[in-house]
């Protein structure tokens, strides 16, 4: 298993991740957003809501 060197993003990237934590993937030379639950997208800019369908009357 290849090890990935990670660190916190620089202050220069403050605000890069809209709803998540910014981590710097050193060996890949890129910033990566670890999104909060419910958010997706490169910069955690999209909110998605998992809708659970209520049971229909015949099952109640």
């Amino acid at each position: 298993v290849a090890q990935v060197s990670i660190t916190k993003c620089s202050s220069d990237m403050n605000g890069y991740c809209l709803h998540g934590q910014c981590i710097y993937l050193v060996d890949m030379s890129q910033n990566y957003c670890r999104c909060e639950v419910g958010y997706t997208g490169v910069r955690c800019e999209h909110f998605f809501l998992t809708v659970h369908q209520p049971l229909s009357k015949e099952y109640v």
């Epitope: 620089s10 202050s11 220069d12 605000g15 890069y16 030379s29 490169v42 910069r43 800019e45």
Partner: antibody, heavy 116, light 106 residues
Framework: QDQLVQSGAEVKKPGASVKVSCKAS????????IQWVRQAPGQGLEWMGR????????KYREKFEGRVTITADTSTNTAYMELSSLRSEDTAVYYC?????????WGQGTLVTVSS | DIQMTQSPSSLSASVGDRVTITCKAS??????IAWYQQKPGQAPRLLIQ???TLQPGVPSRFSGSGSGTDYTFTISSLQPEDIATYYC????????FGGGTKVEIK
């Protein structure tokens, strides 16, 4: 393949303005920050400022504040740098640079010549 | 603004020599420094980022080290194709380039 293609060379008179474009392909500029850097003939590299195209917020180097405007059109995946009140010392190659999803990927540069 | 003081501004060395360039930041930049090589008429080429991480395809004779405010870029054995100007860049807080070091062959 990711690319940043800049507009062509410009010749401007002192006091005029110039607007340089930087069109991205292969990636979405909303996923990145776009920086602008310039280099006068025989001189070093100078960071001018940057835009976050997603939030539409900008940061400028103090010396350019009030004279430079960086914008982005996410519908065309293009960033722009406009410099006003041009003087001869603004003669330089202007580069757009992508940062964020990939560390510092540069455009080919645009030569702006300011001459009366 | 963070200032980056790069030295020397120019140097002349023989093929095979070890070449060292330094950059001093006006405050702690937490290892967020990159090194670029620029040849006449070309855009800068990224060699190293995050102090010491070599970019793919960059020869291993190039290396970087440092922490806090003091950083070093080294060419372990100078080659004719290394003739260029080298720049440091801090990207901890916005961005600032060093003044550049022109490397020539003796």
């Amino acid at each position: 393949q990711d690319q940043l293609v800049q507009s062509g060379a410009e010749v401007k008179k002192p006091g005029a303005s110039v607007k340089v474009s930087c069109k991205a392909s292969g990636f979405n500029i909303k996923d990145t920050y776009i920086q602008w850097v310039r280099q006068a003939p025989g001189q070093g590299l100078e960071w001018m400022g940057r835009i976050d195209p997603l939030r539409r917020n900008t940061k400028y180097r103090e010396k350019f504040e009030g004279r430079v405007t960086i914008t982005a059109d996410t519908s065309t995946n293009t960033a722009y740098m406009e410099l006003s009140s041009l003087r001869s010392e603004d003669t330089a190659v202007y580069y757009c640079v992508r940062s964020g999803t990939r560390f510092d990927f540069w455009g080919q540069g645009t030569l702006v010549t300011v001459s009366s | 603004d963070i200032q980056m003081t790069q030295s020397p501004s120019s140097l002349s060395a023989s093929v095979g020599d070890r070449v060292t360039i330094t950059c001093k930041a006006s405050q702690d930049i937490h290892k967020y420094i990159a090194w670029y090589q620029q040849k006449p008429g070309q855009a800068p080429r990224l060699l190293i980022q995050y102090t010491s991480t070599l970019q793919p395809g960059v020869p291993s004779r190039f290396s970087g080290s440092g922490s806090g405010t003091d950083y070093t870029f080294t060419i372990s054995s100078l080659q004719p194709e290394d003739i260029a100007t080298y720049y440091c860049l801090q990207y901890d807080n916005l961005r600032t380039f060093g003044g550049g070091t022109k490397v020539e062959i003796k």
